[in-house]
């Protein structure tokens, strides 16, 4: 028996359902009574779901997993993982035993899009050219950790005097705060881009300083 899984990681958004694909080629005359199937976490070998003795033994993992019972006899041993969490990320092994045995591992990559950045200035009034100003770009509830880029109005990257911090909340999602310290010119636009490296999703925020008033 040969077990096949997708070589590319499965990308799943937080709180959505994901399918970890696994298949095998049943011999002629195969019946589910002959099948033993185990899904487990590859690293810890923690049991996730099993099928044996002709029966679905159910989820051993947060009661959020399910097989596709009608498709098993065709060799579809895929696992459905419901309401995906950040902690579900990792490698899962599909182990199939009939008169022979084989296994293969599939990776689950969890992702969550970042919110549109909010921009704040400090100080935020009585600004004049030559003043040192702190611009903070904040984006929330994303996963995995973001990449943050700053640019000026001409699209020139601003790399000096940037401090970025990322803090995970209780669900494992990250809040990003990136601080740019610049000396103001006569007027200018400062934009921040928060990129989710897995989703290739970019969230933009900008602030334009034109003497008075400020535009966000």
């Amino acid at each position: 028996v040969e077990v096949q899984v997708s070589e590319d990681p499965v990308v799943a958004l937080v709180d959505t359902d994901a399918t970890l694909r696994c298949s095998f080629s049943p011999e002629p005359g195969f019946s589910l009574a002959q099948l033993n199937l185990i899904w487990q976490l590859t690293d810890t070998k923690q049991l996730v779901h099993s099928f044996t003795e002709g029966r679905d033994q159910g989820s051993a993992y947060s009661n959020r997993t399910a097989l596709f019972p009608d498709l098993l006899v065709q060799g579809n041993a895929s696992l459905r993982l419901q309401r995906v969490r950040v902690t579900d990320e990792g490698s899962y092994t599909c182990f199939v035993s009939i008169q022979d045995f084989d296994s293969a591992a599939v990776s689950l990559q969890v992702a969550a899009p970042y919110s549109k950045p909010s921009m704040t200035l400090e100080p935020n009034k009585d600004l004049r050219p030559g003043n040192m100003v702190t611009i903070t770009c904040s984006s929330y509830q994303g996963y995995p950790e973001a990449e943050v880029f700053w640019k000026d109005g001409q699209g020139v990257p601003l790399t000096g005097n940037v401090t970025t911090s990322q803090m995970a909340n209780e669900r494992g999602l990250f809040d990003v705060h990136s601080v740019l310290r610049v000396v103001l010119g006569a007027n200018g636009t400062y934009s921040c881009l928060v990129r989710n490296p897995v989703l290739q999703q970019d969230a933009h925020g900008s602030v334009t300083i034109t003497g008075q008033p400020l535009t966000f």
Partner: antibody
């Protein structure tokens, strides 16, 4: 008739090497997983290693990992166990077994005796 | 020390029914199944039951296996003198990725 016939056992000193063979007949050898199981004198059964039909998936007991190598030659209908760095505690009768549904072993050879002693 | 736990010995008189237990865990018997082997003195083991309760052809129906949760048992009814042997339970352990045997139970027919 389905048969498994082990050979290659013997007496050797600690640190020595030995290769066991298991000749299979009476069934489609290349379609089945195979195991080695051992039994020390007066003791119970201990699973040693398993290999799937095409040799792509192999498992070992912790007690032999890194020292023993299971392999197969489907063209010769033969299963092998290469045993290196042998220890006194490897002394046992070694059985070759055919894999069956539900993790079972439905056919066993008569066993070959390996004695490791100085 | 075996992953599956069996009593070291059991006994019964001819005609009696005896039961041998095998205790495992969520990752072996609980997740998969259990198989039983009989080893008569001086011979190789023989598969007695598989998938917890099925018998290979040639095994008398006096032998019956069952499983409940993480435990299993082998019942032998109408005990006969030729049933005197060592009995082993076995399973696949998903947390170890190994096949595992119980320590064996020596059955004596009195």
């Amino acid at each position: 008739e389905v048969q498994l016939l082990e050979s290659g056992g013997g007496l050797l000193q600690p640190g020595g090497s030995l290769r066991l063979s298991c000749a299979a007949s009476g069934f489609s050898f290349s379609s089945y997983g195979m195991h080695w199981v051992r039994q020390a004198p007066g003791k119970g059964l201990e699973w040693v290693a398993a290999i799937n039909s095409d040799g792509s998936r192999i498992y070992y007991a912790d007690s032999v990992k890194g020292r023993f190598t299971i392999s197969r030659d489907n063209s010769k209908n033969t299963l092998y166990l290469q045993m290196n760095s042998l220890r006194a505690e490897d002394t046992a009768v070694y059985y070759c077994t055919k894999y069956y549904y539900h993790y079972a072993m439905d056919v066993w050879g008569q066993g070959t005796t390996v004695t490791v002693s100085s | 020390q075996s992953v599956l736990t069996q009593p070291p010995s059991a006994s019964g008189t001819p005609g009696q029914r005896v039961t041998i237990s095998c205790s495992g865990s969520r990752s072996d018997i609980g997740a998969t199944t259990v198989n039983w082997y009989q080893q008569l003195p001086g011979t190789a083991p023989k598969l007695l039951t598989y998938q917890s309760h099925l018998r290979p052809s040639g095994v008398p129906d006096r032998f019956s296996g069952s499983k409940s949760g993480t435990s299993a048992s082998l019942a032998i009814s109408g005990l006969q003198s030729e049933d005197e042997a060592d009995y082993y339970c076995a399973s696949w352990d998903a947390s170890l990725n190994t096949w595992v045997f119980g320590g064996g139970t020596k059955l004596t027919v009195l």
